[in-house]
Amino acid sequence: AIELVPEHQTVPVSIGVPATLRCSMKGEAIGNYYINWYRKTQGNTMTFIYREKDIYGPGFKDNFQGDIDIAKNLAVLKILAPSERDEGSYYCACDT
C-alpha cells in the first residue's frame, strides 16, 4: 500500500530563514505520481499550495518551491522566506 510519511511531525522555523519540509513515499515510486502540498490553518481551512509541475496556489509562487527527489523517493516543499502567516499544518498528497 502506498504511504506518504512526513520526515518530521513538527518543524521549528525562524522568520526569514529558508525551511524545507519533506514527505517520504513508501510502497511506490514517487516519480509515477503527481505530488500536491496543502496547508491547514487554525480555521481548519485546507489551502492548496503546489502541484507538480510548477502549479502554485494564489499567492504561493513567490515564497514556495515544490519538487521531488527521485533518488530519495521523497517530496520537498521549500519555504523561501518564512513569516508568521506561514504557520500551520502542511500536508502532502499524491495522485495520478
Partner: antibody, heavy 125, light 110 residues
Framework: QVQLQQSGPGLVKPSETLSLTCTVS????????WNWIRQPAGKGLEWIGR???????NYNPSLKSRVTMSIDTSKHQFSLKLSSVTGADTAVYYC???????????????????WGQGTMVTVSS | SSELTQPASVSGSPGQSITISCTGT?????????VSWYQQHPGKAPKLMIY???KRPSGISNRFSGSKSGNTASLTISGLQAEDEADYYC??????????FGGGTKVTVL
C-alpha cells in the same frame, strides 16, 4: 514472473527514425520506472533515458535532441523513438525496469533489475 | 555524459577474491548512494548483482559484495568460480536527468 518483450525492426536507414516497443507482462507497469539502454558491439552500456508511468521523461543529455519516449499503461507498453540515426547508433537496444523495493516499502531507483532480450539495430542503407 | 572508470580486465584463480573499482566524480558516485553493478555473459542481457551501493537482490550469492568510498565504488567477488567469468559494469545515478555506466571490466578465472 515479470518479463519484458521487445519488438521493432532490426534495420534502419541513415537519417530515418528508429522505433522500438517494450511490452511488460507478468507484473505491474505502474510501480516502476522504465528505461532504454544501448550497447554497441564489443562496447559498454549507454543509458538513453527513462519514462515514468505518468508520462514524464528524463533523457541522456547527449541524445536528448533526438529521443522521444512514450508509454501506454493500458497496453503495458512503452516505446523509444530515435530520430536522424547514423552508423554510430548501431547497437543492441535493451529495455529495462528500474527500481528495487525492500520489505519496508523503501524504493531504490538507479537499479535495472529486469531486462528485455535486446534488439540488434543496424543503421545501414 | 562521461563514463565511470573501470579497469579493463581483472583476473584471479578459483577460490580467490578479486575487487573491481569504479571511479566517478562528485556529481555521480560521490553524491548518491545509488551505485549498481551488473554481470553480463556473452550474448546475454546484463544481470543486476548489487544495488544502492552494497545491497544484494534476492537470489544473488553473498560472494558478491559492494562498497563505496568517496567517488569510488567497488565490487568484490570472493571464492571466485568459473561461472563468474563475464563482463562487469558499474552504474551510478547522476541526478534525475542522467545515469552513467562504467566502461566495463572483463573478469577472467585462471
Amino acid at each position: 514472473q515479470v518479463q519484458l518483450q521487445q519488438s521493432g525492426p532490426g534495420l534502419v536507414k541513415p537519417s530515418e527514425t528508429l522505433s522500438l516497443t517494450c511490452t511488460v507482462s507478468g507484473g505491474s507497469i505502474t510501480s516502476y520506472y522504465w528505461n532504454w539502454i544501448r550497447q554497441p558491439a564489443g562496447k559498454g552500456l549507454e543509458w538513453i533515458g527513462r519514462i515514468y508511468t505518468i508520462g514524464n521523461t528524463n533523457y541522456n543529455p547527449s541524445l536528448k535532441s533526438r529521443v522521444t519516449m512514450s508509454i501506454d499503461t493500458s497496453k503495458h507498453q512503452f516505446s523509444l523513438k530515435l530520430s536522424s540515426v547514423t552508423g554510430a547508433d548501431t547497437a543492441v537496444y535493451y529495455c529495462a525496469r528500474e527500481g528495487y523495493y525492500e520489505s519496508d516499502g523503501s524504493f531504490f531507483p538507479g537499479a535495472f533489475n529486469i531486462w528485455g532480450q535486446g534488439t540488434m539495430v543496424t543503421v545501414s542503407s | 555524459s562521461s563514463e565511470l572508470t573501470q579497469p579493463a580486465s581483472v583476473s584471479g584463480s578459483p577460490g580467490q577474491s578479486i575487487t573491481i573499482s569504479c571511479t566517478g566524480t562528485s556529481n555521480d558516485v560521490g553524491s548518491y548512494n545509488l551505485v549498481s553493478w551488473y554481470q553480463q555473459h556473452p550474448g546475454k542481457a546484463p544481470k543486476l548483482m548489487i544495488y544502492a551501493g552494497s545491497k544484494r537482490p534476492s537470489g544473488i550469492s553473498n560472494r558478491f559484495s559492494g562498497s563505496k568510498s568517496g567517488n569510488t565504488a567497488s565490487l568484490t567477488i570472493s571464492g571466485l568460480q568459473a561461472e563468474d567469468e563475464a563482463d562487469y559494469y558499474c552504474c551510478s545515478y547522476a541526478g534525475t536527468t542522467n545515469v552513467v555506466f562504467g566502461g566495463g571490466t572483463k573478469v577472467t578465472v585462471l
